[in-house]
């Protein structure tokens, strides 16, 4: 006998980085009957839902009107059908950019170089910060860490044409709030070879994650993220 | 310590080709990537094209595109660039020169002359 | 192509005082900006890097600045070796290009 329902989805919209002062709806998708949802912040109870009619709705919107570093963090959601709870979804990682100061970004040897030839970027931020994020823009969006007192390198290693694309970071001042992005740079990768076997190997970030971040920022609009493979949030832990 | 050593003068016919050597040592080869540079008698800098020696990735200047060939020898920490269908206008030193960020390491120059 | 103009084509100055050479590029290269000494029977060799970074083994009397398009090397006391023609590099985009060259000459 089943003794809990299926994990919901949990998401963002319209993304999970959130320039400070502005709005975000966390929304939970879990079954059509489901009475009772419940939002989690940092493993305590945070908001409460009761969709009516349930048997018609499967999905509920929690509404936060104002980002700040107090929202900012780790959320979960459960529901609710009849007695039976489900499992908890997984972690959401709520962050807020816009904070403080505004890194710079620089690569080495330059922005174009030749497909094979070792490229660094550098993010620096001289305010009190010791994790830095780069961000690779694009549908295959990739995302990196590193450490340092007021800059991080980022060793891509022998690039190749797939490392080609717009690079922004962040600094970090905690895993849940970033800095303002830093301008973009353009690498540029030139040079045919035969050996295409080289690939970036950092992990995965959800598609057009920059994209959806200036949307954010810049027009408000919306966009449903509720097919995201939202463990690639595992970059923040 | 670094250094690049390249091959010695050469004279040759207009219409002919010309490779000019350049072995590396003091590094990790493959780690960089080798450009070279042409000086004309009395001139300026001008560069020719680069290579990756790790996979072989090449990037040239328009100028020399079709006519210049840049190879790299992993094995002998050698880096080759050859020039065909020479004229008297390709009459210059030639330097091979590590691509450390800037150009940080040169080789000490090849004189080529093209004269019939 | 970026194109790099470097002022003025000579530069005279004496022994002991400062020598100041500019260098332009034709569109913004950031920081992207190398500055070379070149001697004449010498190869070129690397003075700054990224406008304004030093140089192990090269004298602290170097020193570049600038940012964008407009750059700038100086050299605060002229030593007699310091006479040579110097190149500025552009390391942003390819081609890469140069300046065609400031000749220091002694005053």
């Known amino acids: 006998q089943q003794q809990t329902l299926p994990k919901p989805f949990i998401w963002a919209e319209p993304h999970f980085m959130v320039p400070k002062e502005k709005q975000v709806t966390i929304c939970c998708q879990g079954n059509y009957g489901a009475v009772e949802y419940q939002l989690h912040f940092e493993g305590s109870l945070f908001a409460v839902d009761r969709p009516k009619p349930p048997e018609r709705i499967n999905k509920v919107k929690f509404y936060i009107p104002d980002m700040n570093s107090r929202m900012a963090g780790q959320y979960s959601c459960i529901y609710r059908v009849g007695e039976l709870w489900s499992e908890p979804s997984n972690l959401l990682d709520l962050v807020v950019t816009e904070m403080y100061d505004t890194p710079t970004l620089s690569v080495h040897p330059g922005p174009e170089v030749i497909s094979g030839e070792k490229v660094t970027f550098y993010c620096r931020l001289d305010t009190a910060t010791s994790m830095f994020l780069l961000l690779k823009e694009g549908r295959s969006s990739h995302v990196q860490r590193g450490y340092g007192k007021v800059q991080a390198e980022f060793p891509l290693g022998p690039v190749t044409t797939a490392h080609r694309g717009t690079y922004r970071c962040f600094g970090s001042y905690n895993n849940h709030a970033w800095s303002f992005p830093s301008e973009p740079v353009k690498l540029l990768v030139t040079g045919d070879i035969e050996n295409t076997s080289l690939a970036p190997e950092d992990p995965t970030f959800p598609a057009d994650t920059w994209g959806t971040y200036l949307l954010t920022t810049e027009t408000g609009l919306q966009k449903d993220h509720a097919l995201w493979d939202h463990t690639a949030q595992n970059l923040l832990r | 310590q670094v250094q690049l050593v390249q091959s010695g003068a050469e004279v040759k016919k207009p219409g002919s080709s010309v490779k000019v050597s350049c072995k590396a040592s003091?590094?990790?080869?493959?780690?960089?990537?080798m450009h070279w540079v042409r000086q004309a008698p009395g001139q300026g800098l001008e560069w020719i094209g680069g290579?990756?020696?790790?996979?072989?990735?090449?990037s040239y200047n328009q100028k020399f595109k079709g006519r210049a060939t840049l190879t790299a020898d992993k094995s002998t920490s050698t880096a080759y660039m050859e020039l065909s269908s020479l004229r008297s206008e390709d009459t210059a030193v030639y330097y091979c020169?590590?691509?450390?960020?800037?150009?940080?390491?040169w080789g000490q120059g090849t004189t080529v002359t093209v004269s019939s | 192509e970026i194109v790099m103009t470097q002022s003025p084509a000579t530069l005279s100055v004496s022994p002991g005082e400062r020598a100041t050479l500019s260098c332009r590029a034709s569109?913004?290269?950031?920081?992207?900006l190398h500055w070379y000494q070149q001697k004449p029977g010498q190869a070129p060799r690397l003075l700054i890097k990224?406008?304004?970074q030093s140089i192990s083994g090269i004298p602290a009397r170097f020193s570049g600045s600038g940012s964008g398009t407009d750059f700038t090397l100086t050299i605060s006391s002229l030593e007699p070796e310091d006479f040579a023609v110097y190149y500025c590099?552009?390391?942003?985009?390819?081609?890469?290009?140069f300046g065609q060259g400031t000749k220091l000459e002694i005053k």
């Open positions: 020169a590590r691509r450390g960020g800037s150009f940080d390491y």
């Open positions: 003091g590094y990790t080869f493959s780690e960089y990537t």
């Open positions: 290579i990756s020696p790790n996979i072989g990735g090449t």
């Open positions: 569109q913004s290269i950031s920081d992207y």
């Open positions: 990224y406008a304004s």
């Open positions: 590099q552009n390391g942003h985009s390819f081609p890469l290009t």
